[in-house]
Amino acid sequence: NQDLPVIKCVLINHKNNDSSVGKSSSYPMVSESPEDLGCALRPQSSGTVYEAAAVEVDVSASITLQVLVDAPGNISCLWVFKHSSLNCQPHFDLQNRGVVSMVILKMTETQAGEYLLFIQSEATNYTILFTVSIRNTLLYTLRRPYFRKMENQDALVCISESVPEPIVEWVLCDSQGESCKEESPAVVKKEEKVLHELFGTDIRCCARNELGRECTRLFTIDLNQTPQTTLPQLFLKVGEPLWIRCKAVHVNHGFGLTWELENKALEEGNYFEMSTYSTNRTMIRILFAFVSSVARNDTGYYTCSSSKHPSQSALVTIVEKGFINATNSSEDYEIDQYEEFCFSVRFKAYPQIRCTWTFSRKSFPCEQKGLDNGYSISKFCNHKHQPGEYIFHAENDDAQFTKMFTLNIRRKPQVLAEASASQASCFSDGYPLPSWTWKKCSDKSPNCTEEITEGVWNRKANRKVFGQWVSSSTLNMSEAIKGFLVKCCAYNSLGTSCETILLNSPGPFPFIQDN
């Protein structure tokens, strides 16, 4: 055993605002003193296996798992997590020890599990095992349900690893499209974990607890439906289970279904078939394709074929991390006072997002609707024609997204005036932003047509509450206009509004609205 290298396993906790944490699994700067994880040789294991002390991490914490190897010569390595191999770049420190690091940013439930590090040195090969779990803070969680096949039975079990224990229900629907909305009479709910009736058109499983309700739909290709223009797409994260159901109905039993991934038949343990006769004596067959824990190489086109139906495919994409894809550039809109208008954001995301619309520090519920092309859309129509800044915010386990909108309402200016001993000011929030004129009313100009250009100062300011622009114009008082009536007028393409002010000595000022 003297050939075995000296190995040290450490855990580095990063402060969450730590800019040094890299996005790769290379070697970020150490932000806190490393914690020794022991790394003892595991007895009775085939091969040389070192086991680090179990690591418990807070949700959203960022950590680095690090191995220091005191062995001569070069080393090569490979990380494996949930059957997926991850990049590994060893380097050497000042003491010439090999250093291998794995960075976990913003810890989530999906990143918990066993991390295996395989190291090959010139002398020997060995494995290091890290077990990472989320610290049991008494936080409630609600996890999206997933499916498992019931042992030795043609049935699906629905599982949601949530705290407190959720109520699990199957939501079944046998008609098409809109009539499968949640409260439709076509929808049947079964409050149980196991489902044997797997022939329905639309099958979802939902889990609910104090935090709300999360659902997962059984992804289905129906060969009796006309092939769609856009290929259905299914996203999954490494380690999640894959389930696709292929369904076909034919006048008799003389047809079979097959699954292929990139033109290769699925392996024996990755599919199972069920068939039944429907009420009108037609034969329904379903063929499930499943992978209990997906890896990157499960990505590809899954094609379901039948001798009696056109083949159809779905693109399955396995990602390391969830995402939200949408354009985050801010958008400005101007509408008329009674024009119907909705903000909308089109996005592609996995896992499904939680979202809110915010206006003037008030949040509004956010609904999302799936489109045929794999995108989803969220619309907000409840703006009540209030101008200002509207914010769409979305997040899932791994990503966040914010988009800003500005709504301007086209309207004639409304003028408010105020005055002090030295100046008079007028304000307007019409849109487009108004231009200003000041006029003096005198014996020579009883209709107030004598324009004042001296001492006028115009500006636009952002009224913070709603994020809407207010235009103002200030007239500095001079001896020439003291004691006179002056008129400030705001005008834009929709009209003009004026206010008349008597510039007398300090004291209350009468204002005469003049539209």
Epitope: L231, E260, E262, N263, Y301, T303, S305, S307, P310, S311, S313, L315
Partner: nanobody, 111 residues
Amino acid sequence: QVQLQESGGGLVQAGGSLRLSCEASGPTFSINYIDWYRQAPGKQREWVAQITRDSNSFYADSVKGRFAVSRDNAKNTVYLQMNSLKPEDTAVYYCRVLSYWGQGTQVTVSS
């Protein structure tokens, strides 16, 4: 990446015939089946026909009995034979493999 190129479109009188071709290049070994679609002006793209690797063919109800799809594996080409053409068959015709589409070929049927 599979590339697809349609050809054979043109102007034809009602009742006439046309044969469209769809030539595939790139990793054609990965082609399990090829679909034909069409898009008439101002309408959604609709599925027309499919031919599988085993030369099984399937058709939309609107073209059944008039259109026939075939393939020549040696030339990596699929054909859509269109007979008894009607003005409502006027459209741009596309072939598709999985997520890959051709540029389309225009078919105009005059009455």
